[in-house]
């Protein structure tokens, strides 16, 4: 019969054949053969593989670092890798959870529209049409833009939500 | 390495006043918003004011509005508190911290004890 070249779901192709993957929680010990199945074997006590796989070694169990302010949420298994969250009062930096902040703040374009509490983050609020922010900042509200007027000014250059306008001189009309 | 170092604390009389210091290195301190924040024995951590990088922009807690004036030192990485007309509600660890608030960027924190 001709190779294959292509395999069923939870099979790969090596060496023109057709193999197993191993399951979630074991690794690739050895590929099958015309005369036996794929080996694997489970993943060690901190180690994890979350999905049908051929790797030949397991991942390692997130560590949630206590001087970070991290703390494990959820224990890892041999098919899961750890969760981790921050202590009480504190807040994750990204969806991954790598390190903690006391609360947020709020980026260039942003204000503060809420000062942080005990027990709710900084609320951002984006800075409308004739405000700016040009910094991060966890209590600076966004600022009007400059009034070139009321300077006997004209405006320049136009403000955007993270830029005050530029005002400079009227053009004198030469007689 | 971010450092913050708080000193200043002790304690004082109910109505006196003391100087809270905190001595930055390890980042470009005029670059960062700064702020002090306490906690209270047995309470969360609470938000006491804030300045902005130039100082020209501050932040008061209700509770310390009028009583407390913070100001920093851009030529000596340097960020104060001064609290004036103290209570025993204001006995707590006070903690300088930087803008974005890392956990591993805090200090020890100093004590401030208001007692008769």
């Known amino acids: 019969p001709e190779p294959p070249t292509a395999c069923r779901e939870k099979q790969y192709l090596i060496n023109s054949q057709c193999c197993s993957l191993c399951q979630p929680g074991q690794k690739l010990v050895s590929d099958c053969t015309e005369f036996t199945e794929t080996e694997c074997l489970p993943c060690g006590e901190s180690e994890f593989l979350d999905t049908w796989n051929r790797e030949t070694h397991c991942h390692q169990h997130k560590y949630c670092d206590p001087n970070l302010g991290l703390r494990v949420q959820q224990k890892g298994t041999s098919e899961t890798d750890t969760i981790c969250t921050c202590e009480e009062g504190w807040h994750c930096t990204s969806e991954a959870c790598e390190s903690c902040v006391l609360h947020r703040s709020c980026s260039p374009g942003f204000g503060v529209k809420q000062i942080a509490t005990g027990v709710s983050d900084t609320i951002c609020e984006p800075c409308p049409v004739g405000f700016f922010s040009n910094v991060s900042s966890a209590f600076e509200k966004c600022h009007p833009w400059t009034s070139c007027e009321t300077k006997d000014l004209v405006v320049q250059q136009a403000g955007t939500n993270k830029t005050d306008v530029v005002c400079g001189p009227q053009d004198r009309l030469r007689a | 390495e971010v450092q913050l170092l708080e000193s200043g604390g002790g304690l004082v009389q109910p109505g006196g006043s003391l100087r809270l210091s905190c001595a930055a290195s390890?980042?470009?301190?005029?670059?960062?918003e700064m702020w002090w924040v306490r906690q209270a024995p047995g309470k969360g951590l609470e938000r006491v004011s804030?300045?902005?990088?130039?100082?020209?922009?501050?932040y008061y807690a209700d509770s310390v509005k009028g009583r407390f004036t913070i100001s920093r030192d851009n030529s000596k990485n340097t960020l104060y508190l001064q609290m004036n007309s103290l209570r025993a509600e204001d006995t707590a660890v006070y903690y300088c911290?930087?803008?974005?608030?890392?956990?591993?960027?805090w200090g020890q924190g100093t004590l401030v004890t208001v007692s008769s």
């Open positions: 804030a300045i902005n990088p130039w100082g020209g922009l501050t």
């Open positions: 911290a930087k803008l974005p608030f890392y956990f591993h960027e």
């Open positions: 390890g980042f470009t301190f005029r670059d960062y």
